[in-house]
Structures are given as C-alpha cells and as structure tokens.
C-alpha cells in the first residue's frame, strides 16, 4: 500500500539534489584555496541534518547552525553586494568585479543557489513531489529558513559602504517583504556599516528618469537613515553596457554614456 | 568611507593657475559621473564642469569653458580640475561631488549628485 503522502503547494526537491550539492562544495573549495579545509561530505551531512526527517514547515534556523559552522567564510566585510529581484546582473557583475561578493559568492550561498529541497516528518525521505510554497503553506520551511539564516549573517557581516542592486522595472523598487527588505536591511551594523549604495537597475532604453526618486526608494532612505546608515542612490540606464564597459573599459563603445 | 575630499586651492594672481585635486577614497567601484561645484558668499552651488565615469565625456559651464579642464584617474581614485587664466571672478569656495549615475545627463544639476566633499577656496586677486 502506497503511503500517504503530503502534498505541498510548491515544487519538490530538485532532482539529484544530494549530488548536485556535493558536487558543488568540491568544486568551490578547489576553487578557493581559503576554503579547502572543508570537508564536504560534513557539510552534506549537516545540511541535510537540518531538514531530514523534520517537518518541513517547522524548521529553525538553529536547525542550521551546524552548517552555519562548518561554511563559515570570511570575505572582505566592505566588498559586500547585495540585491534584490535582479539576481543574474547582480551575480554577471561579480564575475567581472571580483573584488566585489554577493551571497552566492560564498560556500554557502553557492551550494543552495537556486535549488529546493524539503523532507518529511519522521522519515528519512527526501521529498521530491512537492515541498511547502512560503505563501500558500508556510514561512518557516527549510529552504525559507536557510536563505534568512545566510542573509542574516551575510548583512550582519558587512563593514563600510554596502552596496545593494535594485530592479527599476518592477513597482516596488524596493520591496520590503523581499530577503533584502525584510531581513538584510535590518540586520546591518550601524557600528560598522556607515554607507549602504543603492544602484537602481533600468530596464527601458530610453529610460531617462531618475528612479532614485522613486517612493520606495525614499522608503528605504527612511529606513536605512532611521538606523543611523547613510544611504546613497545610483541610477544604473545602461545596464548591458555597464557591465561590458566594467570589463573592458578599454572599449570603443564605453567612451560614450552609459 | 566614502569620502570626498578636495584640495588644491589656495591664493594666486589674475592670470595664474592651479590645480584643485578630490580623492574618492573608500571606493570599492569607482563607475560613477564626477562634478566640480562653486559657491559665492550668499549664493547656490553653480555648475563649474562634470565628467563621466570612465573619463571619455566631459562637460564644462560656458563661464569656464577653454579655461579650466577636468579629468580623473580611477586608479589614483582621484578627480582634477586644472584652471588656467584665472579671474578674480572665479574667487570662490569649490566643491568636488559625485553623481547619481555613470554618464552626464543631469550633471549640470545638484540634485544629479549624492556624495559631496568638504570644499576648498580659491581666491584670485587683481
């Protein structure tokens, strides 16, 4: 007889998803010498030990200290960039400065990016029907729980002048439910973070406003002054442009605007 | 930190030159336009010239255009302003900012700018 089993409203683990974690923590710490003292079939073992057999609308981010411990990173606390809804410019920017790190730049951030995973309560199953949508079933479900923990202590570790990369496109510039509003932004030190930079991405080509004067751009000045951080405004018109002009400054066409 | 700070200026003879310098130290990325501003007793900050980020495209105001010339160095994290036949209409305290984007669009205007450096005074006698 088949088990019952619970159906969520999003998508189930990604396929091969212990592999592809594995996979990815022995490609990272080859890559980065300061980091190959992991072990990463502890850091699997304690990834999964933070949601196997547990359920999946019930997790803590306790339940991910013991891989907290073992990804600890240290990156330059004043290189930090951060974003919010514009993920693939954000990370295509690192790769060209890189000198500069978003969260998926670090073990942590790259062993999670972009995949699902959930198990079920009392069995060592991987679920890969369906793990819980952070709407319509639960917040506190491993994959919600693990990005908040990350992006706390991703916020919490910045210095200086922080940068965070904002889509003009959308309606809300800034969003406050977003990771970024809701969770980075409020766990910058104002001891150590005395600047956070927006750089607010256009999307149209003949986009010439200024969105810095966006409402919710003024909302996040609020905010972000409230906390006794400076905030400063960037308007990005140009992106594809911007980033080829980044990497080759040298180039014919990055002698005009941007 | 960001900070801007401008130097350079100083007491010199109608007809002379000198060299203002800003440092934009505390920058991981320096891809943004940069500004020289003046300011008279009792007046706005005027527009004096802008350049864009990578320092291809300047700007100057019709007051001290064929005089003064703007450049930059990113590596050096350092902005000029080279002003050469100087009045004593240009006696003023100037300001080095930088902008709200990467090219020139509304570098004639303060609100286009978002980080300002502590200015410098130049005074030029006749």
């Known amino acids: 007889v088949p088990r019952w089993r619970q159906q969520w409203s999003g998508p189930g683990t990604t396929k091969r998803f212990p592999e592809t974690v594995l996979a990815r923590c022995v490609k990272y710490t080859e890559i980065h010498p300061e980091m190959r003292h992991v072990d990463c079939q502890s850091v699997w073992d304690a990834f999964k030990g933070a949601f196997i057999s547990k359920h999946p609308c019930n997790i803590t981010e306790e339940d991910y200290q013991p891989l907290m411990k073992l990804g600890t990173q240290t990156v330059p606390c004043n290189k930090i960039l951060l974003w919010s809804r514009i993920k693939d410019l954000a990370h295509q920017f690192t790769q060209v400065q890189r000198d500069m790190f978003t969260l998926e730049d670090t073990l942590l951030g790259y062993l999670a990016d972009d995949l699902t995973w959930c198990g079920e309560f009392n069995t060592s199953k991987i679920n890969y029907q369906s793990c819980p949508d952070w709407r319509k079933d639960c917040s506190n479900n491993p994959v919600s729980v693990f990005w908040k923990t990350v992006s706390r202590r991703f916020a919490e570790a910045a210095c200086d002048v922080v940068h965070v990369m904002l889509n003009g496109s959308r309606s809300k510039i800034f969003d406050k439910n977003s990771t970024f509003g809701s969770v980075e932004v409020h766990n910058l030190q104002p001891e150590k973070v005395q600047t956070l930079e927006a750089w607010v991405i256009h999307g149209g080509r003949e986009d010439s406003r200024d969105l810095c004067q966006d409402p919710t751009i003024k909302e996040l000045e609020s905010i972000i002054s409230k906390r006794n951080i400076q905030f400063s405004c960037k308007n990005i018109y140009r992106p594809d442009k911007f980033l080829q002009c980044v990497k080759n400054p040298e180039d014919s066409s990055c002698t005009s605007e941007i | 930190d960001v900070q801007l700070q401008a130097s350079g200026g100083g007491l010199v003879q109608a007809g002379g030159s000198l060299r203002l310098s800003c440092e934009f130290s505390?920058?991981?990325?320096?891809?943004?336009?940069m500004g020289w501003f003046r300011q008279f007793p009792g007046k706005e900050r005027e527009f004096v010239a802008a350049i864009n980020w990578s320092g291809s495209s300047v700007d100057y105001s019709d007051s001290v255009k064929g005089r003064f010339t703007i450049s930059r160095d990113n590596v050096k994290s350092t902005m000029y302003l080279v002003m050469n036949s100087l009045k004593p209409e240009d006696t003023a305290v100037y300001y080095c900012?930088?902008?709200?984007?990467?090219?020139?669009?509304?570098?004639?205007?303060?609100?286009?700018?978002?980080?300002w450096g502590r200015g410098t005074q130049v005074t030029v006698s006749s």
């Open positions: 505390g920058r991981t990325f320096s891809g943004f336009a």
């Open positions: 900012a930088e902008a709200r984007s990467a090219e020139l669009g509304s570098s004639r205007k303060i609100q286009g700018y978002d980080q």
